[in-house]
């Protein structure tokens, strides 16, 4: 069971990143699915290595002073959402913005029907060029 | 099937990084090989988690003004090369240069004879000290 | 065999990071254990994918001029410690400090009783907020 999906620009104002089965994507079988273009949902309980990579372009003057943060989050059936992993990068002084990449990854127990998704502080700063922003998992 | 190889400084002007089976490297068996010191080639079709880490030292005045980009690329038999993953970092203002690290990783389907390699915008900026720059894969 | 542990602030002056089985941690069975809150120790020989993520907050005026370095290290029974992976980031100019994240990961052969741990140049700069700093492994 494995998946690797590709970032998709979105006009939605939500902080949850959007993904698509496009380009060189992976969706091994129907035991993992991409739902609503925003979350990877698994049908089998078990340990999964889950990862995300986000490239973004920001500038410290144009942004709020808070850093850019990417969060890998979990929603299990009947449970509250919870943060699994986060990473942060301070904004660049490049103009109009400077590129930076964040990588997240870890091993987590997922229940049947559990979904994982990626949140960022400012989706408008995310880079959607080939290979720069992606999200996936693999069952151990 | 798994491999982990270590970066090697090269006098070649190519943007493709060079690797070696040295230090604490991994080469599980002959179903994955390091070819010409530049690419990991697999004999078996399947899903692989492929990763690379590149540490580099750059300065925005001494460098071209473009960001440092690392790309994980795929060459399948009879196919064009394609980019699997990329990451970028804007240059530092540290003198003579500032260290930064990039990590790439994802799950991809590889065909028999497929090769993966790592490209960077400026190989002369790559840090080859112990543990800083490496490349590997594992079959799921 | 898999583990994922969460960073813990420590009053110790050691450069070795401290970890805990808290929050959304993973400890699959007793074939991997967290020892003294500082190292993951495995009982079975084999290939492991080992990873660490460290988020830190530093400022180039307040810090030494040397970059922040995170190292993934190995101690095998009867052997000297050795560095498996390292990553570096130059300090930010943000005030009072700028957040940055480092991710390390690779495939390594571990012997029975081998331990892996994470070293940083300045533990006081590490960010221990939910999800920012973690450490884990999985057996292939």
């Amino acid at each position: 069971i494995a998946a690797h999906v590709i970032s998709e620009a979105s006009s939605k104002t939500t902080s949850v990143l959007q993904w698509a089965e496009k380009g060189y994507y992976t969706m091994s079988n129907n035991l993992v699915t991409l739902e609503n273009g925003k979350q990877l949902t698994v049908k089998r309980q078990g340990l999964y290595y889950i990862y995300a990579q986000v490239t973004f372009c920001s500038n410290r003057e144009a942004s709020s002073q808070a850093p850019f943060i990417a969060s890998l989050c979990l929603k299990s059936p009947g449970r509250f959402e919870r943060i699994l992993l986060r990473a942060a990068n301070t904004h660049s002084s490049a103009k109009p913005c400077g590129q930076q990449s964040i990588h997240l990854g870890g091993v987590f127990e997922l229940q049947p029907g559990a979904s994982v998704f990626v949140n960022v502080t400012d989706p408008s700063q995310v880079s959607h060029g080939t290979g720069f922003t992606s999200f996936g998992l693999l069952k151990l | 099937i798994a491999a982990h190889v270590i970066s090697e400084a090269s006098s070649k002007t190519t943007s493709v990084l060079q690797w070696a089976e040295k230090g604490y490297y991994t080469m599980s068996n002959n179903l994955v090989t390091l070819e010409n010191g530049k690419q990991l080639t697999v004999k078996r079709q399947g899903l692989y988690y492929i990763y690379a880490q590149v540490t580099f030292c750059s300065n925005r005045e001494a460098s071209s003004q473009a960001p440092f980009i690392a790309s994980l690329c795929l060459k399948s038999p009879g196919r064009f090369e394609r980019i699997l993953l990329r990451a970028a970092n804007t240059h530092s203002s540290a003198k003579p240069c500032g260290q930064q690290s990039i990590h790439l990783g994802g799950v991809f389907e590889l065909q028999p004879g497929a090769s993966v390699f790592v490209n960077v915008t400026d190989p002369s900026q790559v840090s080859h000290g112990t543990g800083f720059t490496s490349f590997g894969l594992l079959k799921l | 065999i898999a583990a994922h542990v969460i960073s813990e602030a420590s009053s110790k002056t050691t450069s070795v990071l401290q970890w805990a089985e808290k929050g959304y941690y993973t400890m699959s069975n007793n074939l991997v254990t967290l020892e003294n809150g500082k190292q993951l120790t495995v009982k079975r020989q084999g290939l492991y994918y080992i990873y660490a993520q460290v988020t830190f907050c530093s400022n180039r005026e307040a810090s030494s001029q040397a970059p922040f370095i995170a190292s993934l290290c190995l101690k095998s029974p009867g052997r000297f410690e050795r560095i498996l992976l390292r990553a570096a980031n130059t300090h930010s100019s943000a005030k009072p400090c700028g957040q940055q994240s480092i991710h390390l990961g690779g495939v390594f052969e571990l012997q029975p009783g081998a331990s892996v741990f994470v070293n940083v140049t300045d533990p006081s700069q590490v960010s221990h907020g939910t999800g920012f700093t973690s450490f884990g492994l999985l057996k292939l």
Epitope: E61, Q99, H128 | A66, R86, H91 | -
Partner: antibody, heavy 118, light 107 residues
Framework: QVQLVQSGAEVKKPGSSVKVSCKAS????????ISWVRQAPGQGLEWMGW????????NYAQKFQGRVTITADESTSTAYMELSSLRSEDTAVYYC???????????WGQGTLVTVSS | DIQMTQSPSSLSASVGDRVTITCRAS??????LNWYQQKPGKAPKLLIY???SLQSGVPSRFSGSGSGTDFTLTISSLQPEDFATYYC?????????FGQGTKVEIK
């Protein structure tokens, strides 16, 4: 040597759209930003927007927001600027230029004259 | 938007003269100020970036100074090929904006 070569002059009717191309050669086009700047006859320079070609990030001047779209094709090293709902005051020479770290524009295309007239 | 005001809007000078053009920003732009030269029918050419860095290939008679809100372009000894229009541009904040230009003419 970096060269930016733009598409030819256009004559357009009010209310229509124009799409100007800018093809780069001789350098790493895709790693840099591309800005679009226009200059009305006898007037000064006006910045319209920016794209980072391989990354896909864009920034637009508020004045043109909703009317201008800047895109890029990494495979052909070409950037595009499309301006819609044209009016007579959009008559100008449109330049593409490569932008670097500090927001300076170091290489410029030769310019494309767009005339909007009924 | 940040307003960029150049002065003078035009000047007459002779070959060998020292020429100074000033550019004032309506708010602080740190050192994110660039200078361009434009000749009739041609695209602008970058002279100075980041307030005082000389662009490669540009003669050393051109220099830039200033930070914050007040900036200066100096041509130490005017040459015949320097008769043109000069623009300053701020790249600190979106939208990037240009000064209205200073035309340097032959006296």
């Amino acid at each position: 040597q970096v060269q930016l070569v733009q598409s030819g002059a256009e004559v357009k009717k009010p209310g229509s759209s124009v799409k100007v191309s800018c093809k780069a050669s001789g350098g790493t086009f895709s790693s840099y930003g591309i800005s679009w700047v226009r200059q009305a006859p006898g007037q000064g320079l006006e910045w319209m927007g920016w794209i980072s070609p391989i990354f896909g990030n864009t920034n637009y001047a508020q004045k043109f927001q909703g009317r201008v779209t800047i895109t890029a094709d990494e495979s052909t090293s070409t950037a595009y600027m499309e301006l819609s709902s044209l009016r007579s005051e959009d008559t100008a020479v449109y330049y593409c230029a490569r932008s670097r770290y500090y927001g300076d524009l170091d290489y410029w295309g030769q310019g494309t004259l767009v005339t909007v007239s009924s | 938007d940040i307003q960029m005001t150049q002065s003078p809007s035009s000047l007459s000078a002779s070959v060998g003269d020292r020429v100074t053009i000033t550019c004032r920003a309506s708010q602080s732009i740190s050192s994110y100020l660039n200078w361009y030269q434009q000749k009739p029918g041609k695209a602008p050419k970058l002279l100075i970036y980041y307030a005082n860095s000389l662009q490669s290939g540009v003669p050393s008679r051109f220099s830039g100074s200033g930070s914050g809100t007040d900036f200066t372009l100096t041509i130490s000894s005017l040459q015949p090929e320097d008769f043109a229009t000069y623009y300053c541009q701020q790249s600190d904040s979106i939208p990037w904006t240009f000064g209205q230009g200073t035309k340097v003419e032959i006296k």
